[in-house]
Interface confidence: low
């Protein structure tokens, strides 16, 4: 029987700069029941606080709700693992909420074959930003990426859409069924998961009108 191994805070993510969650990996348990606690203080403060919510983020997590989240302050946190034989501490992690944002996937992905008059047809892909993101405040710039492939193909074709919430794709294989997905990331932060796939059947006459 041994003291617990050193835990590691391996990930912190925020969906929208208003709340965030951190997760840790336990070290070895030393063969004994082990308790974990996360403590933190904000840069410039000396007062230590304990994690306000160990439940919302699931096992081995700490969730910081709105009232505990400030995008203007750096959080310095560590995890303490304790059993009957002793304690061990993770390394301190410095967390700036601005840099840990991982939005939800974009919403309302709509894909349609468009045929403007006397123009080559194209795939028009349109989506909405994730609900939790408030773009009106100007705190966020969301960037988008699209991927698509014929249903049976192995390779995805990737297109960077910048800040647009719609995108045109011209070169497609007639008669094929395509999968289309979109994801987003803030200017500083992480890519969201891909949105659920939308399927679109490309007509076999996907050619110029004239």
């Amino acid at each position: 029987q041994l003291p617990p191994g050193k835990p590691e805070i391996f990930k912190c993510r925020s969906p929208n700069k208003e709340t965030f969650t951190c997760w840790w990996r336990p070290g070895t348990d030393g063969g004994l029941p082990t308790n974990y606690s996360l403590t933190y203080h904000r840069e410039g403060e000396t007062l230590m606080h304990e994690c306000p919510d160990y439940i919302t983020g699931g096992p081995n997590s700490c969730h910081f709700g709105k009232q505990y989240t400030s995008m203007w302050r750096t959080y310095i946190m560590m995890v303490n693992a304790t059993n009957q034989m002793g304690s061990s501490f993770s390394d301190e992690l410095y967390v700036d909420v601005t840099y840990i944002v991982q939005p939800d996937p974009p919403l309302e992905l709509a894909v349609e074959v468009k045929q403007p008059e006397d123009r080559k047809p194209y795939l028009w892909i349109k989506w909405s930003p994730p609900t939790l993101i408030d773009l009106k405040t100007g705190w966020f710039t969301l960037l988008y990426e699209i991927r698509l492939k014929p249903e049976k193909a192995a390779e995805w074709e990737i297109h960077f859409a910048g800040q647009q919430t719609e995108f045109k794709i011209l070169s497609l294989h007639p008669g094929q069924k395509y999968l289309v997905q979109v994801r987003c990331k803030p200017d500083h932060g992480y890519w969201s998961a891909w949105s659920p796939a939308t399927f679109i059947q490309i007509p076999s006459d996907f050619t110029m009108n004239d």
């Epitope: 349609e112 468009k114 045929q115 403007p116 008059e117 123009r119 009108n209 004239d210």
Partner: antibody, heavy 118, light 111 residues
């Protein structure tokens, strides 16, 4: 046989609302764009709005933007035009039309008359 | 201002050839968008007469033909008949309006 049958027209006061319907039959409604086009008494044709097959995309003439809403119910094979804040200059026969491939209007209904007057 | 300009009226005698013009701009016909022509007989709904500049739907007699050049298009009717008396409209997509434009219409009278 392709058929488009408009309904819902009538007399309405300025500022009022009407909803026009266009019942389609004789073709796979969900495979086509659809349009509303109007014709004021003794005047020419004026395009009002169009809507894509799955309702993802809509376009409007500047004269009706913000007041009219085009929609469709593919399960009912029906096209709609919700007209709000109606003005005297909206008085016209309203036609629905089917948009074939490049959206050219290949079949038209017989029209329904909307009269806006106090 | 995006407009398609047509002569308000045209006329001819039976058997004659009549041409109706449709003049647009760089945001519609001149942009490369195709032109469609519609015929509206008195008291009826419009009917597609010519599509994609010069194509005839099935059932339209070959007396009707269309052409396009630059920012203009024209509809020609040869071997004019009394039943051709109608209003004729050109239409094209307009890029700046992101919508359809109809010409003002030409009333054709068969004398």
């Amino acid at each position: 046989e392709v058929q488009l049958l408009e309904s819902g027209g009538g007399l309405v006061q300025p500022g009022g609302s009407l909803r026009l319907s266009c019942a389609a039959s004789g073709f796979t409604f969900s495979s086509y764009w659809n349009h509303w086009v109007r014709q004021a008494p003794g005047k020419g044709l004026e395009w009002v709005s169009d809507i894509s097959r799955a309702s993802s995309y809509t376009n409007y003439a500047d004269s009706v933007k913000g007041r009219f809403t085009i929609s469709r119910d593919n399960s009912k094979n029906t096209l709609y035009l919700q007209m709000n804040s109606l003005r005297a200059e909206d008085t016209a026969v309203y036609y629905c039309a089917r948009g074939l491939d490049a959206r050219r209007m290949d079949y038209w209904g017989q029209g329904t008359l909307v009269t806006v007057t106090s | 201002q995006s407009v398609l300009t047509q002569p308000p009226s045209a006329s001819g005698t039976p058997g004659q050839r009549v041409t109706i013009s449709c003049t647009g701009s760089s945001s519609n016909i001149g942009y490369g968008y195709v032109v469609h022509w519609y015929q509206q007989l008195p008291g009826t709904a419009p009917k597609l007469l010519i599509y994609r500049n010069n194509q005839r739907p099935s059932g339209v007699p070959d007396r009707f033909s269309g052409s396009k050049s630059g920012t203009s298009a024209s509809l020609a009717i040869s071997g004019l008949r009394s039943e051709d008396e109608a209003d004729y409209y050109c239409a094209a997509w307009d890029d700046s309006l992101n919508g359809w434009l109809f010409g003002g219409g030409t009333k054709l009278t068969v004398l």
